[in-house]
Interface confidence: low
């Protein structure tokens, strides 16, 4: 009777062979069967599991002229680039009638030079700072022994005698290369060469040396940089995340830090043209020929208050008998802090000066002594912050008020205002 018609008789007339080879090898497994009637689809198993995405081809050859005659079916499984995951027991599987038929097994094995699962990676490290490198390789054949090399010099007397998967490096003072060799019975494989670039250590002790309303002087201690001298340090400064820009009547501050380069030594830098009474954040990194260190943490710093840069303006002083009415407007120049109030001074030709603290009001009525007999009376006004008094206005003479006349206004010559604080600041 033709093959495949009886449940107990296997239709397979050719079973898969064996393949043993190194990684990357291309090979083919074949099985052949003879069946009566319509040819079945042949499936492949690896270690008993159906290979869903097998690269297989099936060839069918009729042995007679009738569809119900015998057919020869050949299935070929191509293994394109042998990997460890391809190793195992392979069989063909067909469904005939109501029964599964499985071929005799063939075996795929891997044997060759070691294969790297993990190789040392390029990285940057701070000078004199410990770090680890990793290397992992496998056969078969096992065992695989590793030998680490630094700048092409072995770090152990023989494979397997030194550190294996993880190499602990206590620190470097120059840029170095590392690789590892994997040894097994078939020979030696060398990993990629990792370049470990030695960067300067993060600067330490970033601190304020001095503070002025529009100026900060900062200093820091450089970290070790190995055999590579520092070429420069980079300082970044940014306005702290608050509403200073809005309070100063300017648009929101830009979000990117301003970046400045400092020649070294000295490890010190003066930041000028800052906003007074304003919080900033600063940080620093130092660079050698190998690259930059990591940044320090952002250091919060604050400029102190300053005195107003200009006097009050539009001062008007009018006299009516024993009373004088004085009013003014806020200085147009930057206040350099929080305005706490105004001081007013008035003086006659032959009388001592009278000094008054007006507070935050911008007008005052003065009670004059002696029914207005004091001659050549003049008034000066200054604004003040916690840092002190700003410049006094030019003296304004008191003018007699006559009914029906507008009160005289003395438009003082304005001082040149300081430049608007725009970004960048210096």
């Amino acid at each position: 009777a033709p093959r495949g018609t009886q449940a107990e008789e296997s239709p397979f007339v050719g079973n898969p062979g064996n393949i043993t080879g190194a990684r990357g090898l291309t090979g083919t497994l074949r099985c052949q069967l003879q069946v009566q009637g319509e040819p079945p689809e042949v499936h492949w198993l690896r270690d008993g599991q159906i290979l869903e995405l097998a690269d297989s081809t099936q060839t069918q050859v009729p042995l007679g002229e009738d569809e119900q005659d015998d057919w020869i079916v050949v299935s070929q499984l191509r293994i394109a680039s042998l990997q460890l995951s391809d190793a195992g027991q392979y069989q063909c599987l067909v469904f005939l009638g109501h029964q599964n038929f499985v071929s005799q097994p063939g075996y795929v094995g891997l044997e060759g030079l070691p294969y790297f699962l993990e190789e040392p990676e390029d990285r940057t490290v701070a000078a004199n700072t410990p770090f680890n490198l990793s290397c992992q390789a496998q056969g078969p054949p096992e065992p695989v022994d590793l030998l680490w090399l630094q700048d092409a010099v072995p770090l152990a007397t023989a494979p397997g005698h030194g550190p294996q998967r993880n190499l602990h490096v206590p620190g470097l003072n120059k840029t170095s290369s590392f690789s590892c060799e994997a040894h097994n019975a078939k020979g030696v494989t060398t990993s990629r060469t990792a370049t470990i670039t030695v960067l300067p250590q993060q600067p330490r002790n970033l601190h304020l040396v001095s503070r002025q309303p529009t100026e900060l002087e900062v200093a820091w201690t450089p970290g070790l940089s190995g055999i590579y001298p520092l070429t420069h340090c980079t300082l970044q400064a940014m306005l702290s995340d608050n509403e200073v820009g809005i309070q100063a009547g300017e648009p929101d501050p830009p979000e990117e830090p301003l970046t400045l380069q400092a020649s070294v030594p000295p490890h010190q830098l003066r930041l000028g043209s800052l906003h007074p009474h304003t919080p900033y954040h600063i940080r620093v990194a130092c660079t050698s020929s190998q690259g930059p260190s990591s940044w320090t943490h952002w250091l919060p710093v604050e400029t102190p208050e300053g005195v107003p840069l200009g006097p009050p303006e539009n001062i008007s002083a009018t006299r009516n008998g024993s009373q004088a009415f004085v009013h003014w407007q806020e200085p147009p120049a930057p206040l350099q802090g929080t305005l706490l109030g105004y001081r007013l001074a008035y003086q006659g030709q032959d009388t001592p000066e009278v000094l008054m603290d007006i507070g935050l009001r911008q007008e005052v009525t003065l009670e004059l002594q002696g029914d207005g007999s004091v001659s050549n009376l003049t008034v000066c006004v200054a604004a003040y912050t916690a840092a002190g008094d700003g410049p006094w206005s030019l003296p304004v003479p008191l003018e007699a008020w006559r009914p029906g006349q507008a009160q005289p206004v003395h438009q003082l010559v304005k001082e040149t205002s300081a430049p608007a604080f725009s970004w960048p600041w210096w």
Epitope: D122, R123, T124, Q236, P254, E255, E256, P257, T259, P292, S294, S422, W423, P424
Partner: antibody, heavy 117, light 107 residues
Framework: EVKLVESGGGLVQPGGSLKLSCATS????????MYWVRQTPEKRLEWVAY????????YYPDTVKGRFTMSRDNAKNTLYLQMSRLKSEDTAMYYC??????????WGQGTSVTVSS | DIVMTQSHKFMSTSVGDRVSITCKAS??????VAWYQQKPGQSPKLLIY???TRHTGVPDRFTGSGSGTDYTLTISSVQAEDLALYYC?????????FGSGTKLEIK
């Protein structure tokens, strides 16, 4: 308010040329490096060119070098990208972006360029 | 050029869930990583820079973390409006380069 508005995109035949513009407002244009970035139909973002704030330095990837030229007019607050010898793989949405010290913090709405015969 | 790899092309999540999108740099970029969000029909918008600093106006459910070569954008409680493409980008060395993007889908 920072605003970037691209224009000049359209349909062009392979080998043809196109000039994109990016009008900016709301910030001091001459203080910032600027970028052209394109987004392919597969949604991949690729930088196309950047230019320094003064316009003295430009940088291009190999894919466009010799074919694209980026320029700026700081007086007009405008950025340009002159594209020539266009290829089908240049088909993309082109964005101009402002480069701050840490990232591209503001982008335009984009202008579409299609290279097809 | 530095290569930025986003291994997940798509991520599916539900409203209220916590989700983390990862990005790997081909070399140490010393926390110089930005994250962008691109909603359908819009241009990319900056979310995070210097690995963990939120850009102005970005909700605090978005946080960034990471160092060396591995970086993560985390959304602590996903909202429906977070459906978008998310890109990482290194700003360590010009030319700045982007990851290929991760599409966040809401179940």
């Amino acid at each position: 308010e920072v605003k970037l508005v691209e224009s000049g995109g359209g349909l062009v035949q392979p080998g043809g040329s196109l000039k994109l513009s990016c009008a900016t407002s709301g910030f001091t244009f001459s203080d910032y490096y600027m970028y052209w970035v394109r987004q392919t139909p597969e949604k991949r973002l690729e930088w196309v060119a950047y230019i320094s704030n003064g316009g003295g330095s430009t940088y291009y990837p190999d894919t466009v070098k010799g074919r694209f030229t980026m320029s700026r007019d700081n007086a007009k607050n405008t950025l340009y990208l002159q594209m020539s010898r266009l290829k089908s793989e240049d088909t993309a949405m082109y964005y101009c972006a402002r480069l701050s010290f840490y990232a591209m913090d503001y982008w335009g709405q984009g202008t579409s360029v299609t290279v097809s015969s | 050029d530095i290569v930025m790899t986003q291994s997940h092309k798509f991520m599916s999540t539900s409203v209220g869930d916590r989700v983390s999108i990862t990005c790997k740099a081909s070399q140490d970029v010393t926390t110089a990583v930005a994250w962008y969000q691109q909603k359908p029909g819009q241009s990319p918008k900056l979310l995070i820079y210097w690995a963990s600093t939120r850009h102005t106006g970005v909700p605090d459910r978005f946080t960034g973390s990471g160092s060396g070569t591995d970086y993560t954008l985390t959304i602590s409680s996903v909202q429906a409006e977070d459906l978008a493409l998310y890109y990482c980008q290194q700003h360590y060395r010009i030319p700045f380069t982007f990851g290929s993007g991760t599409k966040l889908e809401i179940k």
